[in-house]
């Protein structure tokens, strides 16, 4: 037997954290959003729950909406109607999937102070919002449309063939929810409020995923969805648009799909108005190396929605899937023509481009070995971006502005030496043009919410900035972050370790490796967090270490895409690489490593323990995927193509963790699911179980009942945290 | 301090036109969201219209909108309300109003009579 260890941090006044702290979120940020209502005006929701108007150049402030009215209703959150009359309340908030959730809606009259009677709002309804102008009302019921053109009037029904689990009407189905959408909704406004488009969602032939939820009743429910998995059918789309100014005139009008898109399988990925009287629709192959961008216009005279094959623009990617996550959106100029977006240069480097006729003319505006993520604002003279250019870091985002309006258009980092050391990880919200936007810095010190003038991109007032976390932290040993990148042959790879108080060089610690990995995602960012490993390093003396290996984000396509069509292989593979350059570091007790990750995590923890390295002592996977075959179409097809003979059904069987059993057998494997995993099936952990028994390698596992993807419930949490530490101090030796 | 001072109302003939103003003073005209309100007799205030600080996004009732236009003249700190195609429904007194949103405080406002 090794004789236990303490980990007990020096000769110092302050306190380690404890799990505790984390689990009662102790150490949790504030951030600060402005609800912009005009170019200088927005609501905001205080700490007590009153709904306060700001005028940023008057600097009045007043409560529009008290704590005690949202309280008479029980809500939650609010919307304002933008003739600024009515708002709504919403209360009896119930979660549905990742976006998605039910909630009752009232509505307030403010000029009269109280609540709109007659033609109530149905309950529960699915999704709600007012339309650009003015005060219409549309919602979505029992997967059915609804318009009402006042709060007050009664409603019109719009669509008719909602039918719960089958068609679903301005909302999405699971699949489109999760791995498209990311969304809620599947409807929206014209910027007038003269139309409505909307999409179908047509179910039918998709297989159902059927899992029992225990509840307290004697017999357990059983939880059906539609669920297309890898090579299963797939939701049929249909996109239509209605004038809501005589919805019973003309009814929906159906939007063509571009024929090189309809002629096989296919996906519809967004919708975006350009003006009044002409959209955009973006679509996507089944096989999704092929995305086109769809620009169509209302005739009058014909009363229908025309798609000309000359305003269709075609994206392809020859190395891997088009986009990065998702396929990105355009930014429309205000000629309502020509647009900005964001798609690999030849380079493979993700930047924005302006196109003004066709992709093949497209002038790209950004350029580097580095990437553009995301547009914010086009206005008539900025674009607004963000990126992570600075410093060479793939893991900061900073904000900037080019200048369109000048030639050559000049670039402007709007962020990079704001608060330096604090701030290096921004997002932004913008006024409607760009007058004032407010900066949400997310780390690595203490996040900030800032107040700016658009045109001086002058600080105007600092919105939150976390001093009671500060003063709270100001007693706590907080352990020491570094953003470091390793090389090995040809690669680089940048690495978060999180070092122990006092940590010391000439000593050997326990390494735990936290592990995401998935395709398009990036676990080294430059942001603030107290969470479970912090705890981990600041009390149990345990160095934590992240690696974004081959298939993470930001950082070219050539690094994205070598994981195409082989999960499972690369990412694993340069988890194993950082693990020995981290020993040779020399502060790494090797016979004490450790991997955890959860659901992408958890398929490459419990592939990086049965690699038959013996580079791991132990490992926890937390609702892993176990096989692609078992996970979403959309996701897995994108990464992986076809599970069938002539595509790529051979990598599908042979990346499984199943087909891994044996080498679980030096290991100790700690398992954990919740049962009513909508996402990640349980299915995936029970096959892995089942593999081991068959294999006779013994294994811990933890599974929990009724909890989903998340185990987010709180005495869920705290027993799963509190179980994977106690497993982690016993691998590690570590005295309770 | 805060003064609106609105002229323009008199008496019309269904089917015609006024022009209503607002002259702003005590404030900073330029950075406020503005609005038309009516009082008609006996009733309680009804919201007509709304513009934008820098006057490039306008809201109307559903009951005047495609008669009236709001307008508004930051030079001249000057806020407009021009009524086509009157009805006698729109007989009421007409206040502008610098509450961003309701409920509204107003002033003496400008009689409007539109007569058969």
């Known amino acids: 037997l090794r004789p236990s260890r303490v980990y007990k941090p020096e000769g110092n006044t302050k306190r380690a954290l404890t799990l505790k702290d984390i689990l009662n979120g102790t150490f949790s940020y504030k951030t600060y959003f402005p609800n912009w209502i005009s170019e200088q005006e927005y609501l905001h929701q205080s700490e007590d729950d009153n709904i306060v108007f700001y005028n940023i150049e008057t600097r009045e402030s007043y409560i529009i909406l008290s704590n005690s009215t949202m309280k008479s209703v029980n809500a939650t959150d609010y919307g304002l109607s933008p003739d600024r009359q009515f708002v709504y309340l919403e209360s009896d908030y119930s979660k549905l999937w990742r976006y998605s959730y039910t909630a009752t809606y009232y509505i307030y009259d403010l000029q009269n102070g109280e609540f709109v009677r007659g033609y109530e709002l149905p309950r529960p309804i699915q999704y709600l919002c007012w339309s650009p102008v003015g005060s219409k009302l549309a919602y979505v019921y029992q997967n059915n449309i609804y318009l009402k053109q006042r709060p007050g009037d009664p409603p019109f029904q719009i669509t008719y063939t909602g039918r719960e689990n089958r068609i679903f009407n301005g909302i999405p189905d699971w699949v489109y929810e999760e791995e498209m959408l990311a969304t809620k909704y599947a409807l929206w406004w014209s910027p007038d409020g003269k139309f409505l488009a909307y999409v179908e969602f047509n179910d039918s032939d998709i297989p159902i995923i059927a899992y029992s939820y225990y509840g307290d009743g004697q017999y357990p429910r059983t939880i059906n969805i539609p669920y297309p998995k890898a090579g299963a059918k797939n939701p049929v789309v249909r996109v239509f648009i209605v004038d809501t100014t005589y919805p019973h005139h003309v009814g929906p009008m159906e939007v063509p799909v571009p024929e090189m898109i309809a002629s096989s399988d296919y996906y519809f990925s967004w919708l975006t108005w350009v003006s009044s009287e002409r959209v955009c629709l973006q679509w996507l192959k089944r096989v999704q190396n092929v995305s086109v961008l769809s620009i169509c216009d209302f005739r009058e005279d014909w009363h229908a929605w025309e798609c000309p094959k000359n305003q269709e623009h075609v994206e392809e990617s020859r190395t891997g899937w088009a986009g990065g996550f998702f396929v990105s959106t355009p930014a429309f100029s205000q000629d309502a023509t020509s647009y900005y977006k964001i798609f690999s240069d030849k380079d493979g480097y993700k930047h924005i481009h302006y196109i003004k006729d066709t992709v093949e003319n497209a002038i790209q505006i950004t350029s580097g070995k580095w990437e553009a993520i995301y547009i914010f604002r086009v206005t008539q003279d900025s674009l607004f971006y963000s990126s992570n250019e600075f410093e060479g870091y793939p893991g900061r985002r900073n904000i900037y502005r080019i200048s369109i309006g000048n030639s050559p258009p000049s670039k402007k980092c709007v962020t990079c030496h704001l608060r330096k050391e604090r701030c290096q990880y921004y997002t932004a919200s913008f006024s409607y043009k760009a007058k004032y936007y407010a900066l949400v810095c997310y780390g690595p010190g203490l996040p900030i919410s800032t107040l700016h003038d658009g045109r001086t991109d002058q600080e105007i007032q600092v919105l939150e900035e976390n001093k009671e976390l500060e003063n709270s932290l100001r007693n706590i040993q907080l352990p020491k972050v570094e953003i470091k990148k390793l090389k090995d042959g040809g690669l680089t790879f940048w690495y978060k370790m999180i070092l122990p108080p006092q940590f010391d060089r000439s000593k050997k610690y326990p390494l735990l490796i936290q592990v995401y990995g998935g395709p398009c995602s990036q676990s080294v960012k430059s942001v603030f967090a107290v969470n479970w490993i912090t705890y981990l390093a600041s009390k149990e003396g345990i160095v934590i270490a992240l690696v974004d290996g081959r298939g993470t984000a930001f950082q070219g396509d050539k690094f994205l895409h070598a994981v195409y069509r082989k999960l499972g292989v690369y990412e694993v593979e340069d988890q194993l690489t950082a693990v020995r350059k981290f020993i040779e570091m020399g502060f790494i007790d090797e016979e004490r490593i450790a991997i955890w990750g959860w659901s992408y995590g958890g398929y490459v923890s419990s592939l990086a323990l049965a690699s038959g390295t013996g580079l791991f002592k132990c490992g926890i996977a937390v609702a892993p995927v176990s096989s692609w075959e078992y996970y979403a179409s959309i996701y897995s097809e994108r990464f992986m193509g076809l599970p069938t003979k002539d595509d790529n059904l051979e990598h599908y069987k042979n990346s499984t963790v199943m087909a891994r059993a044996e080498y679980f057998r030096n290991v100790d494997y700690l398992l954990i699911h919740g049962t009513a995993d909508d996402n990640v099936h349980f299915q995936n952990s029970a096959q892995i179980a089942k593999a081991l028994v068959n294999a006779q390698v013994d294994f811990q596992a933890m599974w929990y009942s009724d909890q989903n993807h998340g185990i987010s419930s709180g005495r869920s949490q705290n027993h799963l945290y509190t179980h994977m530490t106690h497993f982690l101090k016993q691998c590690f030796s570590l005295s309770d | 301090q805060v003064q609106l001072q609105e002229s323009g109302g008199g008496l019309v003939q269904v089917g015609g036109s006024l022009r209503l103003s607002c002259v702003a003073s005590?404030?900073?005209?330029?950075?406020?969201?503005m609005s038309w309100v009516r009082q008609a007799p006996g009733k309680g205030l009804e919201w007509v219209a709304s513009i934008y600080a820098d006057g490039d996004m306008t809201y109307y009732a559903d009951s005047v909108r495609g008669r009236f236009t709001i307008s508004r003249d930051n030079a001249k700190n000057t806020l407009y309300l021009q009524m086509n195609s009157l009805k006698s429904e729109d007989t009421a007194v007409y206040y502008c109003?610098?509450?961003?949103?309701?409920?509204?405080?107003v002033n003496q406002g400008t009689q409007v009579t539109v007569s058969s």
């Open positions: 109003a610098k509450d961003p949103l309701p409920p509204y405080h």
């Open positions: 005590g404030f900073t005209f330029s950075s406020y969201y």
